[in-house]
């Protein structure tokens, strides 16, 4: 299964820690992806270590653990964020976070 | 049936540098990641780097960072391995693999290309 | 990084005979583990992935298993056209790495 905070907050300019949790008794993880809305903005597996989308690049630091780092937040960076993780034997699981980025006070 | 056909054998000098292409016949580089391996004569497999080419993005071993450049062009499904500053010990048959991304990430390295033959020599 | 250690470095057979590779890691890496067979001459070639699934296209004679830091590669019944390298690999920890290989000869 797959846990996490399904609505966060932060603050304009600032950062945020995306992170999906996951627990199985039998199934191993070989590739998190992390998606916002529908365009990939993360992949990490161990043959491959972290990979991020070059137009992310400069405000997405991977981590800590399998999450990532969102900076410099920007009121467009407001929607849905996606991790899936893929797992052998076990299949496709996915968390789904709301992120609200509030102007600074 | 996806192959990885690799550009030919090379003889280079000490100090210069050799770039092996590896292309995608028949198919493309969509979910799939490229790894480098290389073999020096008489010795086993070790693991240079890695590219993602719908990022474009590369990792490398400690060993071979800041020497090796893997590249992709998603245009013509080809990645390219760059080595620099070459020495003797790099001597060795390099190959490109294929590594699937998503949901098939387990299946390791499924498809070799045939190997690139670099001899470096004064 | 994470050694892996294999055993024998060598070893002859005969046609017939069943076979046990070992691989050993320097720590636990669960059950990510591959095999892979490599002639003279030719790339290497995926035999098992996840330390026990079997490729596909890839006679039953060959099975894997273990998990954490042993593992094992089995020829039920070796075949004329098994003799060959045998290296096992770990992607539980990046970056990837191999061990020093098996050489099964013919006895």
């Known amino acids: 299964t797959i846990d996490t905070k399904r609505n966060i907050s932060a603050e304009e300019g600032g950062s945020v820690i995306l992170q999906c949790h996951f627990s199985s008794d039998t199934a191993e993880v070989t590739q998190v992806d992390w998606k916002q809305q529908d365009q990939l903005l993360a992949i990490y597996s161990v043959d491959l270590g972290w990979h991020v989308a070059s137009v992310f690049s400069d405000r997405v630091v991977p981590g800590p653990s399998l999450g990532l780092t969102f900076q410099s937040l920007t009121m467009n960076d407001t929607g849905e964020y996606f991790c899936t993780y893929h797992t052998y034997p076990g299949g496709i699981y996915k968390g789904r976070i709301f992120l609200k980025v509030q102007e600074s006070s | 049936q996806v192959q990885l056909v690799q550009s030919g054998a090379e003889v280079k000098k000490p100090g210069s540098s050799v770039k092996v292409s590896c292309k995608a016949s028949g198919g493309t580089f969509q979910n799939y990641a490229i790894s480098w391996v290389r073999q020096a004569p008489g010795q086993g497999l070790e693991w240079m780097g890695v590219?993602?080419?719908?990022?474009?993005?590369?990792n490398y071993a400690q060993k071979f960072q800041g020497r090796v450049t893997v590249t992709a062009d998603e245009s013509t499904s080809t990645a390219y391995m760059e080595l620099s500053s070459l020495r003797s010990e790099d001597t060795a048959v390099y190959y490109c693999a294929r590594l699937h991304l998503g949901q098939k990430a387990y299946y390791g390295m499924d498809v070799w290309g045939q190997g690139t033959t670099v001899t470096v020599s004064s | 990084d994470i050694q892996m250690t294999q055993s024998p470095s060598s070893l002859s057979a005969s046609v017939g005979d069943r076979v046990t590779i070992t691989c050993r890691a320097s720590?636990?890496?669960?059950?990510?583990l591959n095999w892979y067979q490599q002639k003279p001459g030719k790339a290497p070639k995926l035999l098992i992935y996840a330390a026990s699934s079997l490729q596909s296209g890839v006679p039953s004679r060959f099975s894997g298993s273990g998990s954490g830091t042993d593992f094992t590669l089995t020829i039920s019944s070796l075949q004329p056209e098994d003799f060959a390298t045998y290296y096992c690999?770990?992607?539980?920890?990046?970056?990837?790495?191999f061990g020093g290989g098996t050489k099964v000869e013919i006895k």
């Open positions: 590219i993602v080419p719908i990022f474009g993005t590369a």
């Open positions: 690999q770990q992607r539980y920890v990046f970056p990837p790495t």
């Open positions: 720590q636990s890496i669960s059950s990510y």
